[in-house]
Interface confidence: medium
């Protein structure tokens, strides 16, 4: 017996042929003896059965001996033993019919689960295996998840139902959302600008949700909300924004933010989160803000860093072109009674140079300078 | 941690065949394709096929159809590539890469001379 | 078969400065789900190639966040904030959206 695999929703074309190439008469029926279709000379006749309206047959075929039966718009329970009679024979055709589902919208978000189920005739045992447009691959039987998705997991899958030696394919397209970066870190000198920028890792035409940045600064015993937003097409719309810091915020995509002016009480973590148009769960994007002050205060130079570094970050004094003075993997170190000249104080990682502010000692007798 | 390693250089004459082994480590074999890209000398890099472990399906650029054949053994966590009927052009670094288009991890790469 | 085109082939950079490739797809690797099929690799001499930006803008892990990748469709870029001495080797960009995949030619990035 032949078997024939068929993909819910498709159109399939069982053949019969007649050892005469001319037309003969031929019928069609299912393992029910039920008819389905038959010719009459060169006219199609059709049975009783529940395929009516989806069954047919190519009369440009029949003059070849060639009498396929072709089924539309398939559905599962169209899987039978088929049975073409003609010239006193019989071919019979197993059909089975398959589905593929996803169990939600395939617009998913970065780290959540995707499960496929396999909808299959009763009596079957086929196996799937899905693979990624990146060569990622998972197998199952009736259903398969693919957790944790990431970024890369975005694109057509390709899902191949495997059953009495027959391959089926359905393809499936899986869109992952997500931020470009999970984290960055700002560096910044007291009182300069900041810019926060959030940039989304896919490109739609139309996105719509709403978003807020939460705050933790490291001064502070607790976080709190800085600016709540709307997205409607693309277009921003702060809702609400605390008085201080003041922040600013771009009307268009990506999301950027502007804080005025980097102060140590500023310096902490922020976690931006934008919850999409019908989409369970929430993007997150982790900010940090590191912030550097240099200051002279009578006999002692100082310089700090406020803000989230890692311990392997250095952070020295030096007069310029010269020797670091003191070079501590410490968030504050100082010299006392400095000589005059420009200072610089550098935080750096493995020798790059990741913040610097420089600072103006004079001679005793005259106050210090802040370029 | 994910490791490719990959078989020793190669020296072969004019028609003869070579296969390269490529090991993989760190993580299940049969989840990721692997790749074979290669490299002529001073030359750019170069898709020749892909197969996937979990089946050992192959696809194959139709520059080197019906000249390479990729296979793989599940128990020892091994892909191999053969290229058959060598030719002077085919002396290049031979890498293999895990994934079908895009390729986060690389084997070192074999070096195969064909020279009579 | 899509051909990816890169410029300049040869780039002579200084340490500190910034320094910029570009890759030009032949068809757009603009998949329908908003996604750039573009990759960026380095090979430093002497290795294997490491992938650095994949589906057009988003950095592998583990690579330093001086490199970014952006473009869409057809034109994309590959910049480096500030070159490093351990930055030198050739980059290629390939297409991830169609099997085969194909790289560029290779831009070797030298200090000057």
């Known amino acids: 017996k032949k078997v024939v695999l068929g993909k819910k929703g498709d159109t399939v074309e069982l053949t019969c042929t007649a050892s005469q190439k001319k037309s003969i008469q031929f019928h069609w029926k299912n393992s029910n003896q039920i008819k389905i279709l038959g010719n009459q000379g060169s006219f199609l006749t059709k049975g009783p059965s529940k395929l009516n309206d989806r069954a047919d047959s190519r009369r440009s075929l029949w003059d070849q001996g060639n009498f396929p039966l072709i089924i539309k718009n398939l559905k599962i329970e169209d899987s039978d033993t088929y049975i073409c009679e003609v010239e006193d024979q019989k071919e019979e055709v197993q059909l089975l019919v398959f589905g593929l589902t996803a169990n939600s919208d395939t617009h998913l978000l970065q780290g959540q689960s995707l499960t496929l189920t396999l909808e299959s005739p009763p009596g079957s045992s086929p196996s799937v295996q899905c693979r990624s447009p990146r060569g990622k691959n998972i197998q199952g039987g009736k259903t398969l998840s693919v957790s944790q998705l990431e970024l890369q997991d975005s694109g057509t899958w390709t899902c191949t139902v495997l059953q009495n030696q027959k391959k089926v394919e359905f393809k499936i397209d899986i869109v992952v959302l997500a931020f470009q970066k999970a984290s960055s870190i700002v560096y910044k000198k007291e009182g300069e600008q900041v810019e926060f920028s959030f940039p989304l890792a896919f490109t739609v035409e139309k996105l719509t949700g709403s978003g807020e940045l939460w705050w933790q600064a490291e001064r502070a015993s607790s976080s709190k909300s800085w600016i709540t937003f709307d997205l409607k097409n693309k277009e921003v719309s702060v809702k609400r924004v605390t008085q201080d810091p003041k922040l600013q915020m771009g009307k268009k995509l990506p999301l950027h933010l502007t804080l005025p002016q980097a102060l140590p009480q500023y310096a902490g973590s922020g976690n931006l989160t934008l919850a999409l148009e019908a989409k369970t769960g929430k993007l997150h994007q982790e900010v940090n803000l590191v912030v550097m002050r240099a200051t002279q205060l009578q006999k002692n130079l100082t310089c700090e860093v406020w803000g989230p570094t890692s311990p392997k970050l250095m952070l020295s004094l030096k007069l310029e072109n010269k020797e670091a003075k003191v070079s501590k993997r410490e968030k504050a170190v100082w010299v006392l009674n400095p000589e005059a000249g420009m200072w610089q104080c550098l935080l750096s990682d493995s020798g790059q140079v990741l913040l610097e502010s420089n600072i103006k000692v004079l001679p005793t007798w005259s106050t210090p300078v802040q370029p | 941690q994910v490791q490719l390693v990959q078989s020793g250089a190669e020296v072969k004459k004019p028609g003869a065949s070579v296969k390269v082994s490529c090991k993989a480590s760190g993580y299940t074999f049969t989840s990721y394709d692997i790749s074979w890209v290669r490299q002529a000398p001073g030359q750019g890099l170069e898709w020749m096929g892909m197969i996937s472990p979990s089946d050992g399906s192959t696809t194959y650029a139709p520059k080197f159809q019906g000249r390479v054949t990729m296979t793989r053994d599940t128990s020892t966590s091994t892909v191999y590539m053969e290229l058959s009927s060598l030719r002077s052009e085919d002396t290049a670094v031979y890498y293999c890469a895990r994934g079908a288009v895009g390729f986060d991890y690389w084997g070192q790469g074999t070096l195969v001379t064909v020279s009579s | 078969d899509i051909v990816m085109t890169q410029s300049p082939l040869s780039l002579p950079v200084t340490p500190g400065e910034p320094a910029s490739i570009s890759c030009r797809s032949s068809q757009s690797l603009l998949h329908s789900n908003g996604y750039n099929y573009l990759d960026w690799y380095l090979q430093k001499p002497g290795q294997s190639p490491q992938l650095l930006i994949y589906?057009?803008?988003n950095r592998a892990s583990g690579v330093p966040d001086r490199f970014s990748g952006s473009g869409s469709g057809t034109d994309f870029t590959l910049k480096i904030s500030r070159v490093e001495a351990e930055d030198v080797g050739v980059y290629y960009c390939?297409?991830?959206?169609?099997?085969?995949?194909?790289f560029g030619q290779g831009t070797k990035v030298e200090i000057k």
């Open positions: 390939m297409q991830a959206l169609q099997t085969p995949p194909s």
């Open positions: 589906l057009g803008s």
